[in-house]
């Protein structure tokens, strides 16, 4: 028969022959022959391969370095890499999460739109009219101004994006 020029999915071409790729979690020990199947071996402890492959070496699991603020979010298997995340109050500097930085706080006049996670920083938004934030915080949202009317009071000092309104008693008209 004519030697193949292309192989099926999960196969590779070598020596004019289609050999089976090794499944995820296993590495290539020896190519197949006309008579004998590809020989694969499971990856060792702390190693992985996440695709059908012909790799002769497995990849090392990622190390979540505590000195960089990292911790293990999901332990690696023979088929998956370890997933790192950051310690409480910190977040990853990149998608690969190779190091961490402290969550940023939202300054007065800004509130938290989205609280930071292990992989994303705090998202701040300016407090719109009717709302304020008088603290620097990584958790506080913009608070609505106090409604003086519901307390039977009147506005004595207008609120800003950094300060609440100041309410005071209404002036009573004398009879």
């Amino acid at each position: 028969p004519e030697p193949p020029t292309a192989c099926r999915e999960k196969q590779y071409l070598i020596n004019s022959q289609c050999c089976s790729l090794c499944q995820p979690g296993q590495k290539l020990v020896s190519d197949c022959t006309e008579f004998t199947e590809t020989e694969c071996l499971p990856c060792g402890e702390s190693e992985f391969l996440d695709t059908w492959n012909r790799e002769t070496h497995c990849h090392q699991h990622k190390y979540c370095d505590p000195n960089l603020g990292l911790r293990v979010q999901q332990k690696g298997t023979s088929e998956t890499d370890t997933i790192c995340t950051c310690e409480e109050g910190w977040h990853c500097t990149s998608e690969a999460c190779e190091s961490c930085v402290l969550h940023r706080s939202c300054s007065p006049g800004f509130g938290v739109k989205q609280i930071a996670t292990g992989v994303s920083d705090t998202i701040c938004e300016p407090c719109p009219v009717g709302f304020f934030s008088n603290v620097s915080s990584a958790f506080e949202k913009c608070h609505p101004w106090t409604s003086c009317e519901t307390k039977d009071l009147v506005v004595q000092q207008a609120g800003t994006n950094k300060t609440d309104v100041v309410c005071g008693p209404q002036d009573r008209l004398r009879a």
């Epitope: 020596n15 020896s30 190519d31 197949c32 022959t33 006309e34 008579f35 004998t36 199947e37 020989e39």
Partner: antibody, heavy 120, light 112 residues
Framework: QVQLVESGGGVVQPGRSLRLSCAAS????????MHWVRQAPGKGLEWVAV????????YHADSVKGRFTISRDNSKITLYLQMNSLRTEDTAVYYC?????????????WGQGTLVTVSS | DIVMTQSPLSLTVTPGEPASISCRSS???????????LDWYLQKPGQSPQVLIS???NRASGVPDRFSGSGSGTDFTLKISRVEAEDVGVYYC?????????FGPGTKVDIR
């Protein structure tokens, strides 16, 4: 460790049939090609047949082509040699052997053999 | 078919002395991957054959290093650097380059 145990040999008349079996252990049988090799009394080795790990390829020596058929059952971890129209010159010890693959093409582990005597 | 020949067909050696067996093929056993598809086997008296050398020069696991294989194309040699009493038997070369696989006639090695 790799072990191959042949059975099914015996005395048979010319023109009759016999089926040899080879039970394998100690390795992943379904990943390896397998051979039959024979040796007539006091003679040298003669390669008889080979079958690939998933049965897609099988080859037979010209001397047995059309009479002998190599086959395997991976679920039973067993290799077979169906021998029809036997002749006196088929008298031999029949060995089954594992193919060594890319690092050692050809038989690398052999069984102890089973004797087939074709005589009237 | 590829025809294999061996010489000598019989050899008597003194323990501790070297020995050499030649094997020739009627066609080249060198494959495009750079390997020679030539194996050497030893069949000790009353035993099954055992592989000594694969791919012309690769010693099989457990085989003493006094055995070595060399050669390329059509001419191959098996050398025993210092023969021991346990090395007696018949030595066969076999080509695995193409089917039908074929063996040489064998070389009978005896100890003096």
């Amino acid at each position: 460790q790799v072990q191959l145990v042949e059975s099914g040999g015996g005395v048979v008349q010319p023109g009759r049939s016999l089926r040899l079996s080879c039970a394998a252990s100690g390795f992943t049988f379904s990943s390896y090609g397998m051979h039959w090799v024979r040796q007539a009394p006091g003679k040298g080795l003669e390669w008889v047949a080979v079958i690939s790990y998933e049965e897609s390829n099988r080859y037979h020596a010209d001397s047995v082509k059309g009479r002998f058929t190599i086959s395997r059952d991976n679920s039973k971890i067993t290799l077979y040699l169906q021998m029809n129209s036997l002749r006196t010159e088929d008298t031999a010890v029949y060995y089954c052997a594992r193919d060594g693959g890319i690092a050692a093409p050809g038989p690398d582990y052999w069984g102890q053999g089973t004797l087939v005597t074709v005589s009237s | 078919d590829i025809v294999m020949t061996q010489s000598p067909l019989s050899l008597t050696v003194t323990p501790g002395e070297p020995a050499s067996i030649s094997c020739r093929s009627s066609q080249s056993l060198l494959y495009s991957n750079g390997y020679n598809y030539l194996d050497w086997y030893l069949q000790k008296p009353g035993q099954s054959p055992q592989v000594l050398i694969s791919l012309g020069s690769n010693r099989a696991s457990g085989v003493p290093d006094r055995f070595s294989g060399s050669g390329s194309g059509t001419d191959f040699t098996l050398k025993i650097s210092r023969v021991e009493a346990e090395d007696v038997g018949v030595y066969y070369c076999m080509q695995a380059r193409q089917t039908p696989f074929t063996f040489g006639p064998g070389t009978k090695v005896d100890i003096r």
